[in-house]
Amino acid sequence: MKVLQEPTCVSDYMSISTCEWKMNGPTNCSTELRLLYQLVFLLSEAHTCIPENNGGAGCVCHLLMDDVVSADNYTLDLWAGQQLLWKGSFKPSEHVKPRAPGNLTVHTNVSDTLLLTWSNPYPPDNYLYNHLTYAVNIWSENDPADFRIYNVTYLEPSLRIAASTLKSGISYRARVRAWAQCYNTTWSEWSPSTKWHNSYREPFEQHHHHHHHHHHH
C-alpha cells in the first residue's frame, strides 16, 4: 500500500482543515488508514482523524481544531496500521478556503431597489471576520446568458442594485461566496441560492442595456 498523491489540506481558518490524498489502488480509507495530526506547540496533544473514501483510491479527512493563529503549524502522519506511509506538515494560514456565507436574503420591498443581505460566516473574534470580501452571482432561470457577478469589496455583507438592471417579470436566483485578500485565500464555496421574482415595472419608453460583470481570481 502506497500513497500515490500526497495529502493536500485547506483550512477554514476556524475549526476544520480538510486533507485529501490518493492511494495507489482501491482502499477502504476508514478501516485501513489513520491520519495523525498535532499542533507544534506546548501541551498540544496528537489527534487521530479517521478518513472517509473519496472515490475508489481517494481519501479525505476532516481535522478538527479548537482555534487557529497565523503561525500555526501541524505535523501530519499517515498510518496504515503500524506502517508510516507519509509524513508532512501543514500551515493553515497558508492554505485558507473561507467558510461560505449564509442566510442570503433578497429584500424586494424597497421601491425600485433590490437589497441582498447575507451573514458573515465567522464570529467577531476570528481574524477573517473583518477581512472578507464577497462576490454575488445573479442569474436568470429563464435565460442562461443573463448571468452576472457583482464584486462586493467593502466589509458590509450586503449589496444594493437597481431592480431595473434586471429584466422585469421573470425569476432570478442569487448566491454569494467569500474570499480574504489578507491570506490570499481561495474562494469559498457558493452559498445556497435564493430565488425571487423581479416585478419591477419598466417605463414604456425605457431601453435597457444589460452589463455583464465578470471577475476572475
Epitope: F41, D66, D67, S70, A71, P123
Partner: antibody, heavy 116, light 112 residues
Framework: EVQLVQSGAEVKKPGATVKISCKAS????????MHWVKQAPGKGLEWVGR????????IYASKFQGKATITADTSSDTAYMELSSLRSEDTAVYHC?????????WGQGTLVTVSS | DIVMTQTPLSLSVTPGQPASISCRSS???????????LEWYLQKPGQSPQLLIY???NRFSGVPDRFSGSGSGTDFTLKISRVEAEDVGVYYC?????????FGQGTKLEIK
C-alpha cells in the same frame, strides 16, 4: 520553563497613562493569543481583551474599548497593555494570560494604583 | 454580553467531604465550531488563577482527579469529590466561546 513575567507595580495620577508589559519565555507569543484580565481589589476576574501577536488583530470587551490598547512585539516575545485617562476605578491587578485555546499560563500580575 | 452566574458565592466544607459549584450562562455557550469553551479556574490566596477544567469536562494536566466538570447548554457544574486543605481559594467559571469572554463572579471555598 514556560513563564509570563510582568512589569512591576505602577502608581499613577488620575488622567495619566500607563503601559505595562508581559514577557514570555519558554514559548513564542506568535503561537498563542495574548489576553489581559483585570482584577480590582477584593473583586473577581474581568476579561479586558486579546491580541493575535502575528497580525496585531485585537478585540476588547466594550467596557475597555478606548481605555485599553493591547500591542505585541514578536521579536521580543512581549505583550503590552496601555491604559489611558486613568481613574480610581482602574486601580487593579492586571494579569496577562496566554490562551491556546485555554488560559494555561498566567503572569504574576501587575498592580496599577491610581491615586491623586 | 453573556452573564455567567455562579452559586453558591461561598461554601465551607469539611476536609474529605464533597463540594459542588454551579455555573449558569445567560445564553448558550456553544461556539460556532461546535465546541463549548467552558472552563474552571482556581485562584489560591495570593496567587494568579490556575486552570482546572477546559471544554466542560477535561482536566488540565497535573490537576488531581478529585476535580471533575460536567454540564451542557447553559448549566455547568464543578465537583470536588473529597475536599483537601490545598483546595481553598476562589473558583471561577469562564466562557471563551463568545466575545466578550466572561467570568463568573467567583465562589470562595473555605475549609471548616
Amino acid at each position: 520553563e514556560v513563564q509570563l513575567v510582568q512589569s512591576g507595580a505602577e502608581v499613577k495620577k488620575p488622567g495619566a497613562t500607563v503601559k505595562i508589559s508581559c514577557k514570555a519565555s519558554g514559548f513564542n507569543i506568535k503561537d498563542t493569543y495574548m489576553h489581559w484580565v483585570k482584577q480590582a481589589p477584593g473583586k473577581g476576574l474581568e476579561w479586558v481583551g486579546r491580541i493575535d501577536p502575528t497580525n496585531g488583530y485585537t478585540i476588547y470587551a466594550s467596557k475597555f474599548q478606548g481605555k485599553a490598547t493591547i500591542t505585541a512585539d514578536t521579536s521580543s516575545d512581549t505583550a503590552y497593555m496601555e491604559l489611558s485617562s486613568l481613574r480610581s476605578e482602574d486601580t487593579a491587578v492586571y494579569h496577562c494570560v496566554s490562551r491556546r485555546p485555554w488560559f494555561a499560563y498566567w503572569g504574576q500580575g501587575t498592580l496599577v494604583t491610581v491615586s491623586s | 454580553d453573556i452573564v455567567m452566574t455562579q452559586t453558591p458565592l461561598s461554601l465551607s466544607v469539611t476536609p474529605g467531604q464533597p463540594a459542588s459549584i454551579s455555573c449558569r450562562s445567560s445564553q448558550s455557550i456553544v461556539h460556532s465550531n461546535g465546541n463549548t469553551y467552558l472552563e474552571w479556574y482556581l485562584q489560591k490566596p495570593g496567587q494568579s488563577p490556575q486552570l482546572l477544567i477546559y471544554k466542560v469536562t477535561n482536566r488540565f494536566s497535573g490537576v488531581p482527579d478529585r476535580f471533575s466538570g460536567s454540564g451542557s447548554g447553559t448549566d455547568f457544574t464543578l465537583k470536588i469529590s473529597r475536599v483537601e486543605a490545598e483546595d481553598v481559594g476562589v473558583y471561577y467559571c469562564f466562557q471563551g466561546s463568545h466575545v466578550p469572554y466572561t467570568f463568573g463572579q467567583g465562589t470562595k471555598l473555605e475549609i471548616k
